[in-house]
């Protein structure tokens, strides 16, 4: 198989509702027309499939319907939101990227994003 | 390991049709992209036709409008229609999954089938 470079930001804070952003983008050699996105969190040692998404380029990129990532695309960059993270979510998260259409087939496997999630402090009870 | 296991070549007469199968060991193949390849005496091995998980097919382009490559992810098998042959169409035909499960890239291929076309 021939490797692929990709791109995605080494460090992303998940803001205070837990979700977490960040742009995925591809170095293609050619015009691929289906692509197949995977995000993998790796902890510990352990890695572990977060979501997975195919789009044929051109449509919208639709994960499953209980999927807690959402997703969009923009020639070879993937706008990707991963949502519903608290503190123990805590880890590297991996965009791993097929191009399964047309022929050569390709894969790249990113650095990681840390992805920090630091749960919300209970709003603290009123005496008023 | 996964094994690929290619079926149904043979000898036909020229103008005729075989059916190739590629049965997987594991269910891999409906995430991978499926392909069929072939080496012709005294040439290098060449792509003939792919299928990839979404369906989209691709053949090289002495084959086209006589090669129909499908796949059956229940059957974890890939086929090659191959009709209206021709002694150039004379080779062993090797089956090819490629892909990844997590971080493991895989490229696995079959022993191949030995198609002759003559009269």
């Known amino acids: 198989c021939k490797a692929m470079h990709v791109a995605q930001p080494a460090v992303v804070l998940a803001s205070s509702r837990g979700i977490a952003s960040f742009v995925c983008e591809y170095a293609s050699p050619g015009k691929a027309t289906e692509v197949r996105v995977t995000v993998l969190r790796q902890a510990d040692s352990q890695v572990t499939e977060v979501c997975a998404a195919t789009y044929m380029m051109g449509n919208e990129l639709t994960f499953l319907d209980d999927s807690i990532c959402t997703g969009t695309s923009s020639g070879n960059q993937v706008n990707l939101t991963i949502q519903g993270l608290r503190a123990m979510d805590t880890g590297l998260y991996i965009c791993k990227v097929e191009l399964m259409y047309p022929p050569p087939y390709y894969l790249g496997i990113g650095n990681g994003t840390q992805i920090y999630v630091i749960d919300p402090e209970p709003c603290p009870d009123s005496d008023f | 390991e996964v094994q690929l296991v290619e079926s149904g070549g043979g000898l036909v007469q020229p103008g005729g049709s075989l059916r190739l199968s590629c049965a997987a060991s594991g269910s891999i193949l409906s995430i991978a992209v499926a392909g069929w390849y072939r080496r012709q005496p005294g040439k290098e091995r060449e792509l003939v036709a792919t299928?990839?998980?979404?369906?989209?097919?691709h053949y090289v382009d002495s084959v086209k409008g006589r090669f129909t490559i499908s796949r059956d992810n229940a059957k974890n098998t890939v086929y090659l229609q191959m009709t209206t042959l021709k002694p150039d169409d004379t080779a062993a035909y090797y089956c090819?999954?490629?892909?990844?499960?997590?971080?493991?890239?895989?490229?696995?291929w079959g022993k191949g089938t030995q198609v002759t076309v003559s009269s």
């Open positions: 299928i990839s998980p979404g369906n989209n097919t």
């Open positions: 090819n999954a490629k892909g990844s499960i997590l971080l493991n890239a895989f490229d696995y």
